[in-house]
């Protein structure tokens, strides 16, 4: 999906109002310095591409993020403010249903959510030069 036509300011507002808090709740009890940020993004569409991938694509050691509240709200924000996004997710949803696992918070999931926090922060500062 091409995130170029999303309403970035509305997505930013949703992030600042709630998704950020849900991410913090998920990470509660974890030191902010515990994980190094290894995933980066260069502009808002790229950030949303990376955010979608990390939030919804199961990875080795972390298959359970899609059912978290921050993930549901992320998906809603993309569906509401990115024209045509929902239509692109139908096939992905069918695949997800086949491999859904019960929610388990692993260290790998905490690391992944830490990466997500970094991507969202970058999304909110689009004018900053890439380090």
């Amino acid at each position: 999906y091409d995130f170029t036509n999303c309403d970035f300011e509305k997505i930013k507002a949703a992030y600042l109002s709630t998704i950020s808090k849900d991410l913090i709740t998920y990470m509660s009890g974890t030191k902010s310095t515990e994980f190094n940020n290894t995933v980066s993004c260069s502009n808002r569409p790229h950030c949303l591409t990376e955010i979608q991938s990390l939030t919804f694509n199961p990875t080795a050691g972390c298959a359970s993020l899609a059912k978290e509240m921050f993930a549901m709200k992320t998906k809603a924000a993309l569906a509401i403010w990115c024209p045509g996004y929902s239509e692109t997710q139908i096939n992905a949803t069918q695949a997800m249903k086949k491999r859904r696992k019960r929610k388990v918070t692993t260290n790998k999931c905490l690391e992944q959510v830490s990466q997500l926090q970094g991507l969202w922060r970058r999304f909110n500062r689009p004018l900053l030069k890439q380090q």
Epitope: A79, I80, P83
Partner: nanobody
């Protein structure tokens, strides 16, 4: 002050249908995303569906896709949730929210939906 009032809940048999309504006052309806959350006993609150009345874009949780339909009537300042093919696992208190990220002051009091034979 924003007020959201849900109605339409009740007891229904599995496979049955219900239509929930959310009447809003104190806000310009078409400029806000309207959402429905639900909370089953002993479970976390879940975002079920949301609609942007201005763009007519919608979100549905995977668990309700194809069974639930959200709509909005800007002239009546009301959002609707049509629930078909109801399952026992749909039993919950359903809450309407102005903007799916809104704080507690922008929530209704909830309406109970019970799916049981």
């Amino acid at each position: 002050e924003v007020q959201l009032v849900e109605s339409g809940g009740g007891l229904v048999q599995p496979g049955g249908s219900l239509r929930l309504s959310c009447a809003a006052s104190g806000l310009t309806f078409g400029t806000h995303v309207m959402g429905w959350f639900r909370q089953a006993p002993g479970k976390e609150r879940e975002l079920v569906t949301a609609i942007n009345p201005a763009a007519l874009t919608t979100y549905y949780a995977d668990s309700v896709k194809g069974r639930f339909t959200i709509s909005a009537d800007n002239s009546k300042n009301t959002a609707y949730l049509q629930m078909n093919s109801l399952k026992p696992e749909d039993t919950a208190v359903y809450y309407c929210a102005r903007d799916f990220w809104s704080a507690g002051d922008s929530w209704g009091q909830g309406t109970l939906v019970t799916v049981s034979s």
